[in-house]
Every structure is written in C-alpha cells, then in structure tokens.
Amino acid sequence: ATKLTEEKYELKEGQTLDVKCDYTLEKFASSQKAWQIIRDGEMPKTLACTERPSKNSHPVQVGRIILEDYHDHGLLRVRMVNLQVEDSGLYQCVIYQPPKEPHMLFDRIRLVVTKGFSGTPGSNENSTQNVYKIPPTTTKALCPLYTSPRTVTQAPPKSTADVSTPDSEINLTNVTDIIRVPVFN
C-alpha cells in the first residue's frame, strides 16, 4: 500500500533544496502543479505553480523557487535556492484539478535550514550556492487562490513514528539528514 511519508532535509543557509515529486503520467501530465508550505493549523499556502496547462521541461521561477515539470516522465522538480532559516517548514507538491480538490503528491518534505556558512574549511558538505544556475527562460505563473482544508495536518508525534534513516553508507551532498516518517491522515 502507498504510504504518505515525510522526508526531512537538513540544509544550511545558502544551499539549495532540490527535490522531485512523481505523479501518474497518464492522468496529470499537463495539469497545473504547485509547491505549497503547510504551517501547523493553517491552510496550505501555494508558493509557486506551473503554467496552465503545464509545459514540458519549461522552468517557472517565482522568487527563489524554480519548478520544472518533466511531462514525459511524470516528474515535477522543485528547487529552492539560496535557502534562508525562515524557509524551514513542511512542504508538499499538489496537482490542481478544478473543480475537485488539489491532488496531493508523495512525499512531504520537512525542511530544516540552519545558520552557518556552507562549504567552509573543514565542512564535509559542498554548497550548491555557487553551483546553481538560473534557467535561461523562466516564466512567472499565476496560481489559483485555492487551498484544501483536507490537507491541513500536523506531523505525527515522534513516539508513534516509524522512523527509518538512510543506510549508513549514504553520504548525500547538501543533505545532512533525511528521515522518512509515515504521516497518518
């Protein structure tokens, strides 16, 4: 059975969050997709969305967020560049399908951004801040002012979470900790 999970990314200020959300190609290829932040007890807030209809491999930039929808592969890529401490929070990808409620994609992302310069001597992480390139053509898309009460949740208490951490040999650049936590709605 498919489990809605939460993955934790711990990054430093200035680094880039680079994630992907997968969707059912046949159903949602050209649907408009959005990146939302979920604050405890509040409605999810849309921060950026693709065009409508969504264009293939066409980067859309809203501030420090870049969305790229790979239609052919059923993947939405989300990049948040030059991360700030205040970007910390719970995020999710959704697909707009009016008049129905937005369709939530797996997985949710728990982003924790901490102070501290990345890539300093002695650091075992490489910063992507000097590496990231802004796509040559970007479009600012208008997002529907629509949120779904159904997706207002709080993460499960730690005591009930079945936490499985990455294999010990994994060393992800720019990611100090990724923890997968099932979310029970």
Partner: antibody, heavy 123, light 107 residues
Framework: QVQLVQSGAEVKKPGASVKVSCKAS????????INWVRQATGQGLEWMGW????????GSVKKFRDRVTMTRDTSISTAYMELSSLRSEDTAVYYC????????????????WGQGTLVTVSS | DIQMTQSPSSLSASVGDRVTITCQAS??????LNWYQQKPGKAPKLLIY???NLETGVPSRFSGSGSGTDFTFTISSLQPEDFATYYC?????????FGQGTRLEIK
Amino acid sequence: QVQLVQSGAEVKKPGASVKVSCKASGYTFTSYDINWVRQATGQGLEWMGWMNPNSGNSGSVKKFRDRVTMTRDTSISTAYMELSSLRSEDTAVYYCVRLIGYSSAYKWSFQHWGQGTLVTVSS
Amino acid sequence: DIQMTQSPSSLSASVGDRVTITCQASRDISKYLNWYQQKPGKAPKLLIYDASNLETGVPSRFSGSGSGTDFTFTISSLQPEDFATYYCQHYDNIPITFGQGTRLEIK
C-alpha cells in the same frame, strides 16, 4: 547490506515480451526509486527509466515509452521491467539500480546495481 | 537531450601512471555529473557523484573536478585493479544520459 538480485538470462523471439524481476533486500524497498539501465554487448550504458515503489508511478525515455512497463510488488520487495515487441537490437544486459538518495531527492546517482539480466532476442 | 562526450575513447597506461579522462556536456549541467567504473562481466560501480564527491569506500586515488560543461576524472596512481571502462553520466535534467565510455587498458 543493500542487495538487488535479478532474474536469470532469457532468450526470446522477435515480437515477444520479456519480464525481468529485481528483488531488493537490506533496505526499505518503498523508500528508494528503482531505475533500469541497459547495455548492449560491447556498448555503453543506456538509461531506460525509473519507478517509485511507494507510489507505483514510473517514467521512461521516449525510445521505450510504448514498449516498457515498470511495476512492483511491495509485499515481496520486487520490481519488474517488462519490454514488449522485442527486436534484435534489444539484445542487452538489463540492470535494475537503486539511487543514492530517497525517492524525493533529485539525485540520480546510481549507487546499488543488480547483477544484470542478459536478454537475447533471436529468431 | 544532453549529449555527453568522453575522451579519449580508449587509453593505454601503466601501473603507477596518472590518468585523466574528460567528459564534455553539450550544455551547462552545473555539477550534476557522476563517474562509474565497469569491469568486464560486472555491473558498473559509482565512484564519484556531483562532479567531485568520492563515494564511500572508493580509494582516494580517484578524483573528479569541473562544472558547467567540462569535467575531469583522474586516477592519481594507477593500480592493477583500475583497468576497466569508465563512464560519466549527467542528471541536470531528464532524460539522464551517459558518456560513451573510456576503456583503460594496460600498456
């Protein structure tokens, strides 16, 4: 430790289909995407596509889109890749591969490889 | 699709030599580049990810550098077990593509 064990070699006639299995162990199967990469004899590596074992969603390159189906059985931690309408140029070793990071990470680094399955297409 | 061009396609060297392989992308791929080693009859093995990060357990004689379109893979002092074929692979966007490979042979 992480292990991906693939099914044995297959010999198929042109026009037939082949289904290669990939049994995962040593990690949480639904937490990491499985990708498929093939290599014709004496040739380079060719990425075919990916599958998220949790959602069941998958995607493949245009070249294979109409002929490839990627599925999984989470109860036995096994991924499958079926290629139909086989032709002689599909003769290759097919590898299932696990990425370095969780399914949500945009990090296509192929860290753990199966031993490969040789598929021979011959009349 | 992004094309990855490796050079040379084959290379003869001796144990102890310093060996360099280059990989050129048809457009800027930032640091989204990996290097693999493959021995005959075996599956490829990830050596370097994100252009310069050494995979856990890989000897430090292997290194990678570069960003944008030009990348370099170096073996500082060739060992007998290093004779193999090496591939670069980008993942700046989808689809993912590999270089055609560089075959490293004993001189």
